[in-house]
Structures are given as structure tokens and as C-alpha cells.
Interface confidence: low
């Protein structure tokens, strides 16, 4: 499991003649947002085919109005990363589609209108856990600059996020600071730790302890935008240390917009700008239909008669979720018996059995006593996935090979003295006491 992350650096007119000044106009202010679609492998798939690795939609960028006669500035972009979680192995080779959408905010009846400005696509090789890769793509007269990476979510590690790194109970053969890895237990994994506090959104590192900034960010921890004023918001009390106004609570605090909607403040309240497929005051109403192709992983879309949904996805085996977007967690059904560890490898389930059990689902209880002898007249006892010896008097240890001192546990009560005897132990009781263990 892991996350593919995309950072858009800039979108605007490309170099050369005939480039458009701006996607927005003085008459129609607009703002941009982006959609990324990921597919495994290097196939030239149609844009409409399912985003089998996942898809993500950015927040809306700030509103932009072209000023006639003014030089075209860089277009304001949405904040933050586009993140596409993946549940299984990272394929290493993948195809991507990045769409730039324009949301026109004119006075048209019925709210904002959306239009696709540019679509870029590419095929890449990328190892998980590597540094940010930079890219420039052109679509017609537009140019898009971006960075991307794939990172594993613990406990997954490795270039495909398929190795699980968990501390083992056995002493580690790995050096200091290295973690032992399962299932390849002879491998050791060195965690790449950036400088403490390095921004996870705007910073990255290729060496332990460093913090390198993505374009547009600066500072030792990459937390400072390159060209921002020192003061934040004109709302709230003034800070004694900076003299700047500290933001007080606002209508967008806690983001009242559902389903990935972005919130912007209005003079009286707030306004949600909803992603495609959602609408309503808080983006709470779904407007996705089968025409939008909402079913992933080969799911079949039918118009829902159920009043709670405008469509229903019939998912193929192995997938679930309202959009067939989730691979069925087959391990949640606990198919491995007798305490076996379940591993969902995507193409198959694997059970790692505890000692004493075997079979595809650890269903076979091995004969723990087969070939196991207990010394000195001890008897082998089955159970718990490991053999156990019930030892004859005077012997102990796993195989009854150790001579036991029956007096070691001080069995004689009330100050009685213990004597080891071939048949066991004998207690010589203190005056006034009696019984086999001087208990009376």
C-alpha cells in the first residue's frame, strides 16, 4: 500500500507564438482545478478507460480575472498535493492523465460552468520510495509543469511497496538503525528520514537529514511560500510578536464542504465549490450518473432505482465499494486458521502458518510429537503448535533432559526443611506443623 503524489507547479501559456494569454477573461473570471488518473502498465489506454490505479481531484484554485492590458501573470493554482492512494503493489510502470479544468464563475444561470482546458498524458517508470520526478508536458498552446512520486505507507517498503517491515521477536542481525524485514528476513531496510519538521507537502529528501524544497517553497523546512506577504489574513486579533493579524474563526474553518468541495468565504457566509459530480450548498448531493463513467475496475454501471443513488456499480469479483474502487480485503474474512498470518498478494492469498500448522489455510495440525522423544520417562503432550513434555519426577526442561531440584521452589511451608529423595521430595516440618508440605 502507498500513495502516488502529484504536485502541480505551474500551468499557463506555452512558449512561442499563438499562445493564449489566459484561460479566463475580464468578462468571465474563472479558477482552475486538476484531475489525475492513473493506470498500471505502459499501455496507451483511452482516456475513458478506468483509472485502475486510482484518480484524484484537486481543490479549486483562487479566482482569477484577466486585467485588460496587464501582462499575463502566472495563473493561481490550487494549494496542496493531489494524492492517489494505492492498496496493492506499486506497478513500477504506469500511465497517467492529468486534466486541467476551468470553472467559469460568470453570471450564467445555474451556477458555475466547467470546461476541460488541457489534457496531458504520459507513460513512465517510477520506483516507489524514490525522489520527486519533475516533468513538463504541453497540450496545444498550454504548458504544465509538475512533480510526482510514489511512496509506501508503513509497514510496506521497497520499490513496489510489497515488502512488509515489521520488528521481529528474534534478535536482529541488522546493524544499528536498520529494521529487519519480513518476509525476506535476511534483508534489512534503512529508513530514509528527512530533517525533522521538513514539510511533507513541499519538501523532500534524497539523503537522510536533508530537506529540499519543491518549486515555490523555501525555508529550512520548506514551509515558507516564496512570494507571500508576511501577514496572513485581515481577520482576527493582532499578534504581538509579528504585528500581523492572526486569523480568527471563519465560516470556512473545518471546511463545511463535503465530498472534496473547496470553501471560500463570502461577505455573509461561505460558498462551496463542488467537484464534478457533486452539488448543493455543501456539495452533499451527488450528481454523478453512468454517463460520467463512475465505476472503476470494470464495474458495470446501471441507473439506480434506489432513491439514495443515481447509479449503481455492479463490481467484478475481488472489488467492492460504491464505485468498485476498493479491492476486497480478503484477509478481513480471516481465512487463515490457527493463528496464521494472512497476506493478500493481489493475485492470490497466502497464509503464513504458525509452527505446528500447515496447509494453504493452516488447517492441518501437524503431529507435534512425531519424532519427538521425551527423555527420562517423560511423556509428549500435543497442542498449541509445539510439543511439550510432561516430565517424570526429578526431571525438567523442554525434553526432560535436565535434572530438576525438587526443593528449588521451596515447597515446605512454615519453615519446614526440604530434602531431595529419589521418589520426590520430603519435608521435615518445624515443631507444631505437619502434613506432606508442613501446611497444617
Amino acid at each position: 500500500a502507498g500513495v502516488f503524489e502529484l504536485q502541480i507547479h505551474s500551468f499557463g501559456p506555452g512558449p512561442g507564438p499563438g499562445a493564449p494569454r489566459s484561460p479566463c477573461s475580464a468578462r468571465l473570471p474563472c479558477r482552475l482545478f486538476f484531475r489525475v488518473c492513473l493506470k498500471p502498465g505502459l499501455s496507451e489506454e483511452a482516456a475513458e478507460s478506468p483509472c485502475a490505479l486510482g484518480a484524484a481531484l484537486s481543490a479549486r484554485g483562487p479566482v482569477y480575472t484577466e486585467q485588460p492590458g496587464a501582462p499575463a501573470p502566472d495563473l493561481p493554482l490550487p494549494d496542496g498535493l493531489l494524492q492517489v492512494p494505492f492498496r496493492d503493489a506499486w506497478p513500477g510502470t504506469f500511465s497517467f492523465i492529468i486534466e486541467t479544468w476551468r470553472e467559469e464563475l460568470g453570471d450564467q444561470i445555474g451556477g458555475p460552468a466547467w470546461s476541460l482546458l488541457a489534457r496531458v498524458a504520459g507513460r513512465r517508470r517510477l520506483a516507489a520510495g524514490g525522489p520527486w520526478a519533475r516533468d513538463i508536458q504541453r497540450a496545444g498552446a498550454w504548458e504544465l509543469r509538475f512533480s510526482y512520486r510514489a511512496r509506501c505507507e508503513p509497514p510496506a517498503v521497497g520499490t513496489a511497496c510489497t515488502r512488509l517491515c515489521r520488528p521481529r521477536s528474534a534478535p536482529s542481525r541488522c546493524g544499528p538503525g536498520l529494521r529487519p524485514c519480513a518476509p525476506l528476513e535476511d534483508e534489512c531496510e534503512a529508513p530514509l528520514v528527512c530533517r525533522a519538521g521538513c514539510s511533507p507537502e513541499h519538501g523532500f529528501c534524497e539523503q537522510p537529514g536533508e530537506c529540499r524544497c519543491l518549486e515555490g517553497w523555501t525555508g529550512p523546512l520548506c514551509t515558507v511560500p516564496v512570494s507571500t506577504s508576511s501577514c496572513l489574513s485581515p481577520r482576527g486579533p493582532s499578534s504581538a510578536t509579528t504585528g500581523c493579524l492572526v486569523p480568527g474563526p471563519g465560516p470556512c474553518d473545518g471546511n463545511p464542504c463535503a465530498n472534496g468541495g473547496s470553501c471560500s468565504e463570502t461577505p455573509r457566509s461561505f460558498e462551496c465549490t463542488c467537484p464534478r459530480g457533486f452539488y448543493g450548498l455543501r456539495c452533499e448531493v451527488s450528481g454523478v450518473t453512468c454517463a460520467d463513467g463512475p465505476c472503476f475496475n470494470g464495474g458495470l454501471c446501471v441507473g439506480g432505482a434506489d432513491p439514495d443513488s443515481a447509479y449503481i456499480c455492479h463490481c467484478p469479483p475481488g472489488f467492492q465499494g460504491s464505485n468498485c474502487e476498493k479491492r476486497v480485503d480478503r484477509c478481513s474474512l480471516q481465512p487463515c486458521r490457527n493463528g496464521g498470518l494472512c497476506l493478500d498478494l493481489g493475485h492470490a492469498l497466502r497464509c503464513r502458518c504458525r509452527a505446528g500448522f500447515a496447509g494453504p489455510r493452516c488447517e492441518h495440525d501437524l503431529d507435534d510429537c512425531a519424532g519427538r522423544a521425551c527423555a527420562n520417562g517423560g511423556t509428549c503432550v500435543e497442542g498449541g503448535g509445539a510439543h511439550r513434555c510432561s516430565c517424570a519426577l526429578g526431571f525438567g526442561g523442554r525434553d526432560c533432559r535436565e535434572r530438576a531440584d525438587p526443593c528449588a521452589a521451596r515447597p515446605c511451608a512454615h519453615g519446614g526443611r526440604c530434602y531431595a529423595h529419589f521418589s520426590g521430595l520430603v519435608c521435615a516440618c518445624a515443631p507444631g506443623y505437619m502434613g506432606a508440605r508442613c501446611e497444617f
Partner: nanobody, 130 residues
């Protein structure tokens, strides 16, 4: 992109009847029933108000209290057309009538809320004289 075109408005005497039509185009006929649709009206100097709605999938209908028992909304799926049958017209029904659509299911209790609809027609004028 869905386009909506209304027709059927006109001038009538109080107590008369009209049938307004709204043809939806630019949307696959096979999924036309997925559109939630509604009629709104706006009288001069007043706010737009929802009068009748029909939700997708279930086809359940909702009406404003002021028009109940006089207005009937219906959908002709074969011709991608929404209708509003108006009986016993009153002078206060005078307004511009707009057809609106949304590509999805809308909670019936909120189906007369204008900002839930993404697509709008240009409107047809209804004038009722006493």
C-alpha cells in the same frame, strides 16, 4: 452538456389552463431518466421559487404549497420532455417559468431548492389576467 428549451407559455384568463413543455437535449436518451428536473418561476421583483419537481430514478414528485392540486409535473421519457400541466390559473401565477435539471438524484424534500440544479432553460412567460 444538457440544454433545456421551454415552450407553451402565453396569456390566459384566470381559471384557464396551460401545458408547459421542456425538451432536454445533449443528454443520452438511455439515461434521460437519471435527470432530476423541476419547474421554477420568477415574478417581476420577486425571488425565484420552485413550484414542482420530479426526481430521477424513483420519479417521485414534489409541489409548492401554493400550487398543490392545480399543477401536475410529468416526464415523457420517450421524447426527453418535461411537462407542467397548470389548471385553474390565478393572476398570482403570472411569472417567467424556468425548467431546470440536475444529473442525479435529489432528496425530494429539497427538490425545490434552486442551487441544486445545474442546467437551466431560458424560460417561457405565463401571464394570467383577471
Amino acid at each position: 452538456q444538457v440544454q433545456l428549451a421551454e415552450s407553451g407559455g402565453g396569456s390566459v384568463q384566470a381559471g384557464g389552463s396551460l401545458r408547459l413543455s421542456c425538451v432536454a437535449s445533449g443528454y443520452p436518451s438511455s439515461t434521460y431518466y437519471m435527470l432530476s428536473m423541476a419547474w421554477f418561476r420568477q415574478a417581476p421583483g420577486k425571488e425565484r421559487e420552485g413550484v414542482a419537481a420530479i426526481t430521477s430514478g424513483t420519479g417521485s414528485t414534489s409541489y409548492a404549497d401554493s400550487v398543490k392540486d392545480r399543477f401536475t409535473i410529468s416526464k415523457d421519457y420517450a421524447n426527453n420532455t418535461l411537462y407542467l400541466h397548470i389548471n385553474n390559473l390565478k393572476p398570482e401565477d403570472t411569472a417567467m417559468y424556468y425548467c431546470a435539471a440536475a444529473s442525479g438524484w435529489i432528496v425530494p424534500s429539497r427538490s425545490l431548492t434552486a442551487n441544486l440544479y445545474r442546467y437551466w432553460g431560458q424560460g417561457t412567460q405565463v401571464t394570467v389576467s383577471s
